[in-house]
């Protein structure tokens, strides 16, 4: 059975979100894909691939780049120079019609916050990485962290939270990590 989880990514302004959405090759290789933001109950399409999808033919709409790899069954999404107003819930979808889309797994909850006072914002190509490593301390993410996977003290000004609703885990039981290096 497939687990549906909502993944929460926290960034500072200026950083880059880089995620992937997988799909069934045999079903959707030639379908258009889209990246949408949920605004109220209505999703807003921010960018969509061409039809038919071509390998390594990126589509750029403002700060968003979509690159479909139909040979691999993957859609790569990049959102650069993140701003506070980019915060929200995002989804990859198979775009069949403006009013009919098939949602791919794992909606992304993006939270973008201002950088600390006195600290210049990260450059546009700063990337936040979801990663793991043996745990030393879990203080940085605080008590609201609810994840079945990883946790750690992240480097200054960058954290990632991956949450699964209804599966709260005590921080002291978490053995893996999310590490978020920041590129300057």
């Amino acid at each position: 059975t497939t687990e549906l989880t909502e993944e929460k990514y926290e960034y500072k302004e200026g950083q880059t979100l880089e995620v992937k959405c997988d799909y069934a090759l045999e079903k959707y290789a030639n379908s258009r894909k889209a990246w949408q933001k949920m605004e109220g109950k209505m999703p807003k399409i921010l960018a969509k691939t061409e039809r038919p999808s071509e390998n390594s033919h990126p589509v750029q709409v403002g700060r968003i780049t979509l690159e479909d790899y139909p040979d691999h069954g993957l859609l790569q999404v990049r959102m650069t120079n993140l701003q506070v107003e980019d915060s929200g819930l995002y989804q990859c979808v198979i775009y069949q019609h403006p009013k009919e889309s098939h949602v791919l797994f794992n909606p992304i909850c993006l939270v973008v916050t201002k950088g600390s006072s006195g600290t210049p914002g990260s450059s546009e190509n700063s990337t936040q990485n979801v990663y793991r490593t043996p745990s030393t301390t879990a203080k940085a993410l605080g008590p609201r962290y609810t994840s079945p996977r990883t946790v750690t003290q992240a480097p200054p000004e960058s954290t990632v939270v991956v949450s699964t609703p209804g599966s709260e885990i005590n921080l002291t039981n978490v053995t893996d990590i999310i590490r978020v290096p920041v590129f300057n």
Partner: antibody, heavy 122, light 107 residues
Framework: QVQLVQSGAEVKKPGASVKVSCKAS????????INWVRQATGQGLEWMGW????????GSVQKFRGRVTMTRNTSIHIAYMELSSLRSEDTAVYYC???????????????WGRGTLVTVSS | DIQMTQSPSSLSASVGDRVNITCQAS??????LNWYQQKPGKAPNLLIY???NLETGVPSRFSGSGSGTAFTFTISSLQPEDIATYYC?????????FGQGTRLEIK
């Protein structure tokens, strides 16, 4: 203990198929991609493809397309890689490797199996 | 496909030496580059991810730098246990490709 344990060495005849298994333990199997990388004797590393153990979706590089099948059994935390129509040049050590979190464009291979030697010989 | 060219293909150095290995990408891969160490008969081991980040548990004598198309892997003071083959690997796009490897020997 966080580890990937692979099945034992195989000897196959040209034209046959081989199915290599990779058992994950010590972490949440469905939350990280599983990748397959092979290495012919004395040669470099060659990425074959990936699988998302949660969705079951997978993809492979062009040269293996149609010959490789990646599957999994989530109840026992095992990933499988089956390669068909074997030829002598497929003789190699086949590694499974844990990739990044399934939704992240992070292709670090931070955990590897010990490898499975597949010999193709008539 | 992005080609990753490592140099040198092999090198011999003395214990305590500073060793540099370079990796050139055929196109811009930003910082999407990892370095692995592979000892004979063993699986590869991740040392550096995203060009410059040291994997947990890896000795601090290993480091990485670079972005775009040019990357360098450095061992600040070579130790006998560092005898291995070292590989770079990009993941800017698909397919993922590795460099051909650099075989490191002790003089």
């Amino acid at each position: 203990q966080v580890q990937l344990v692979q099945s034992g060495a195989e000897v196959k005849k040209p034209g046959a198929s081989v199915k290599v298994s990779c058992k994950a333990s010590g972490y949440t199997f469905t939350r990280y991609d599983i990748n397959w990388v092979r290495q012919a004797t004395g040669q470099g590393l060659e990425w074959m493809g990936w699988m998302n153990p949660n969705s079951g979706n997978s993809g492979s590089v062009q040269k293996f397309r149609g010959r490789v099948t990646m599957t999994r059994n989530t109840s026992i935390h095992i990933a499988y890689m089956e390669l068909s129509s074997l030829r002598s040049e497929d003789t190699a050590v086949y590694y499974c490797a844990r990739g990044g979190y399934t939704s992240s464009w992070r292709w670090y291979f931070d955990l590897w199996g010990r490898g499975t030697l597949v010999t193709v010989s008539s | 496909d992005i080609q990753m060219t490592q140099s040198p293909s092999s090198l011999s150095a003395s214990v305590g030496d500073r060793v540099n290995i370079t990796c050139q990408a055929s196109q811009d891969i930003r910082k999407h580059l990892n370095w692995y160490q592979q000892k004979p008969g063993k699986a590869p081991n991740l040392l550096i991810y995203d060009a410059a980040n040291l994997e947990t548990g890896v000795p601090s004598r290993f480091s990485g730098s670079g972005s775009g198309t040019a990357f360098t892997f450095t061992i600040s003071s070579l130790q006998p246990e560092d005898i291995a083959t070292y590989y770079c690997q990009h993941y800017a796009n698909l397919p993922i490709t590795f460099g051909q490897g650099t075989r490191l020997e002790i003089k």
